[in-house]
Amino acid sequence: MAVTACQGLGFVVSLIGIAGIIAATCMDQWSTQDLYNNPVTAVFNYQGLWRSCVRESSGFTECRGYFTLLGLPAMLQAVRALMIVGIVLGAIGLLVSIFALKCIRIGSMEDSAKANMTLTSGIMFIVSGLCAIAGVSVFANMLVTNFWMSTANMYTGMGGMVQTVQTRYTFGAALFVGWVAGGLTLIGGVMMCIACRGLAPEETNYKAVSYHASGHSVAYKPGGFKASTGFGSNTKNKKIYDGGARTEDEVQSYPSKHDYV
């Protein structure tokens, strides 16, 4: 029950996180005009990953897309790439995790297969969250660098009395959305990985029953049945010819691969 709850909660948290990553990527307010210590302008500038916008105090807003690829800063391209990779991994992770949910029955899919899918989706969510956090952090670092550079030459003199005001940009709402969403996706991924450990069925080891035949002493020990997962060979039923039954202490316990997660 706890495993199902952990898996379900992990899925929901990751779903919210990925929705947030998508929202952050699409938002225009990655950087916004810094209003502190600046002359009050009747124009407010803000920029996203895909376009820059200007909102006038009249209420008129105009946005212009970045219609060039080669002309954009490498850092911006890197942030775009990280966010897209995060979204793609997250979307695949969501798809995999839907089929992995313990509460959803799909044919005769065994728990071990669900455990593997849960682990896979968990890892995908973790990487997705890390991509989003990295992307947002790179952009934030870029903003901080540019902010202090523009503060150093806040007013550039132009022929005596005439001055040009340098527009400074600070953190926009999308950065906070991205950080929170990345964190949620990461947490959801960790929860999925934790749930995976509890999903895998442990080996059922039966006590050996000994049959004393004339002339030979043969013991049959049925092994645990486990579906093939691709992560290792199946533990098949093994006939053990050792001239007698094993004691309880001698019964071999086969470690599950999930013990190493």
Epitope: Q33, P39, V40, T41, A42, V43, N45, Q47, S52, C53, V54, E56, S57, S58, G59, F60, E62, R64, M158, V162, Q163, T164, V165, T167
Partner: antibody, heavy 118, light 113 residues
Amino acid sequence: EVQLVESGGGLVKPGGSLRLSCAASGFTFSNSAVSWVRQAPGKRLEWVATITSGVSYTYYLDSVRGRFTISRDNAKNSLYLQMNSLRAEDTAVYYCTRQFKGNALDYWGQGTSVTVSS
Amino acid sequence: DIVMTQSPSSLSVSPGERVTISCKSSQSLLNSGNQKNYLTWYQQKPGQPPKLLIYWASTRESGVPDRFSGSGSGTDFTLTISSFQAEDVAVYYCQNDYFYPLTFGAGTKLELK
């Protein structure tokens, strides 16, 4: 047709108060930023205050800040300017205007005259 | 506050003549976000409220005759009337629409010669 009609002007003693009103029609008032601009006899135009749409940010000329209050009632399509502690230098024709692209003032009322004199 | 300096203060013009009015601002009115200059030109005829002519320094308001044009960037701007008409007799104002307080120039009075 866009129309802005000011009212509430008149003669008032220094230190007195007056409330100007502007009735708007012919456009979506709630979506528009609106301003008051004044013009003293024979002088240049002087912007007084602006109130934006939506969250209604307000901006004032330094010499009127604290004395004048711009407000709006979107339900009544009306703009107001509450003027307190009036001075002789506030004597002017007060125009109600709508802000347009580029923050330009595209529609103006006919104006209402305010005279501050003892 | 931004100081708007207009010149000349007055001008006598003959019909058909080309007129240029200059406006200088104490700070750049160019917004880096959209590369637009927040300068507006108005025409005010005697006894009337002002009328919007040009916004964003060079965009003509609808219904304004094409003999009116605006140009300039940053701090230096110009209003040009390519062929002055008798009905153009008025006072012309430039306005800073970028910084609060929104400030107007002192105006240029155009008279018929």
